[in-house]
């Protein structure tokens, strides 16, 4: 009876999400393997988040708009492990917008989800950020490693979206 009611709840939750995401990929987790965590197909999952690499070229504002249409934000990177996971799926000759900007050019960087900007957990390339006119951040491959660079926000780039996993 308990299992039946849990299944019914799951099905109704799935139907609720189906109007936003035609397909979800779910895995069982939790200590009793009773919880399902899901990401929209074909997003990838890492820890408690889902990630989508957008290969369409857009300005930073449009990229954030595009992520929000999908119920996400431009990616906020909190750890080196998270960055290493994300970069496995990136092309080394491309650049991708992050959810990090300096709107006034005062070198006050801020994440789109209001996560505090911690200078100790940043992965800027050597010598970056280097211009107060470049107010948006990308991740790209340079000098044999992935890192961040400040760029002009209006020049189109690819982007990375991030959202919380859906639990059912």
């Amino acid at each position: 009876n308990f299992m039946y009611s849990k299944t019914v709840k799951r099905l109704s939750k799935l139907q609720e999400y189906q109007q936003y995401y035609p397909s979800l990929t779910c895995v069982m987790e939790g200590k009793d393997m009773e919880d399902w965590s899901c990401c929209p197909t074909p997003w990838t999952s890492f820890q408690s988040s889902c990630y989508f690499i957008s290969t369409v070229m857009q300005s930073w504002t449009k990229s954030q708009n595009n992520c929000s249409v999908m119920g996400a934000d431009l990616v906020v990177i909190n750890t080196k492990e998270e960055q290493d996971f994300i970069t496995q799926n990136l092309k080394i000759n491309s650049a991708y917008f992050l959810g990090l900007s300096d709107p006034k050019g005062w070198r006050h960087w801020q994440w789109v989800d209001q996560t505090p900007y911690n200078k100790n957990v940043t992965f800027w390339h050597s010598g970056e950020p280097n211009s107060p006119d470049e107010r948006c951040a990308i991740i790209n491959f340079r000098s044999e490693e992935w890192g961040w660079n400040d760029v002009h926000c209006h020049v189109p780039q690819k982007s990375i979206c991030k959202m919380k996993k859906i639990y059912i």
């Epitope: 369409v56 070229m57 857009q58 300005s59 504002t61 449009k62 708009n65 249409v69 650049a95 006119d133 760029v151 002009h152 926000c153 209006h154 020049v155 189109p156």
Partner: antibody, heavy 120, light 107 residues
Framework: DVQLQESGPGLVKPSQSLSLTCSVT?????????WNWIRQFPGNKLECMGY???????YYNPSLKNRISITRDTSKNQFFLSLNSVTTEDTATYFC?????????????WGQGTLVTVSA | DIQMTQSPASLSASVGETVTITCRAS??????LAWYQQKQGKSPQLLVY???TLADGVPSRFSGSGSETQYSLKINSLQPEDFGNYFC?????????FGGGTKLEIK
């Protein structure tokens, strides 16, 4: 005020390469923005061909496959279009255009255009 | 690529009349639409960006409207200098494609 000026041969033979120069005055092409080539066919249809960004990175319209290259000479504040293996279908007026104005919402600065005819 | 369908292809009107040109996108372009005017032998001139904002120096008789996939350019009280070709262009995702154009002629 920024000004763009196209130059290059007006007549190119089929199968040869088309090469055009855009000279920019009033703004450094390495400071910001992205620098486009757009063409207009005889029936007035417009096509974005590709661009070179202020940082030197490129985008090319997939419809032009591997025929297109856009490069620059920062010392002369110029950028260039090279289109290989041209056919009569490449006959058009070619414009150089600055991109990224109005938070990338419209192209405000255009060259006056140069007509290129592909003919034997 | 997003396709832009512009109509009508041509239009005859008299000075003082009001005309409307429409543009339909094959997908939602989130108001990232520009309108241009082009005179014979000249380069296109930006009139409107972000669907409804007039570019610098554009007279207030021009106005843009629309959302999602449907957009229009309205010209009130046509002036002799308004005749020429008009193009729409989306600015949502690269490549930014143009409509086929509307030729506005004097009746």
């Amino acid at each position: 005020d920024v000004q763009l000026q196209e130059s290059g041969p007006g007549l190119v033979k089929p199968s040869q390469s088309l090469s055009l120069t855009c000279s920019v005055t009033g703004y450094s092409i390495t400071s910001a923005y992205y620098w486009n080539w757009i063409r207009q066919f005889p029936g007035n249809k417009l096509e974005c061909m590709g661009y070179i960004s202020y940082d030197g990175s490129n985008y090319y319209n997939p419809s032009l496959k591997n025929r297109i290259s856009i490069t620059r000479d920062t010392s002369k504040n110029q950028f260039f279009l090279s289109l290989n293996s041209v056919t009569t279908e490449d006959t058009a007026t070619y414009f150089c255009v600055r991109g990224g104005d109005y938070d990338d919402g419209g192209f405000a600065y255009w060259g006056q255009g140069t007509l290129v005819t592909v003919s034997a | 690529d997003i396709q832009m369908t512009q109509s009508p292809a041509s239009l005859s009107a008299s000075v003082g009349e009001t005309v409307t040109i429409t543009c339909r996108a094959s997908g939602n372009i989130h108001n990232y639409l520009a309108w241009y005017q082009q005179k014979q032998g000249k380069s296109p001139q930006l009139l409107v960006y972000n669907a409804k904002t007039l570019a610098d120096g554009v007279p207030s008789r021009f106005s843009g409207s629309g959302s999602e996939t449907q957009y229009s350019l309205k010209i009130n009280s046509l002036q002799p200098e308004d005749f020429g070709n008009y193009f729409c262009q989306h600015f949502w995702i690269i490549p930014y494609t143009f409509g086929g154009g509307t030729k506005l002629e004097i009746k």
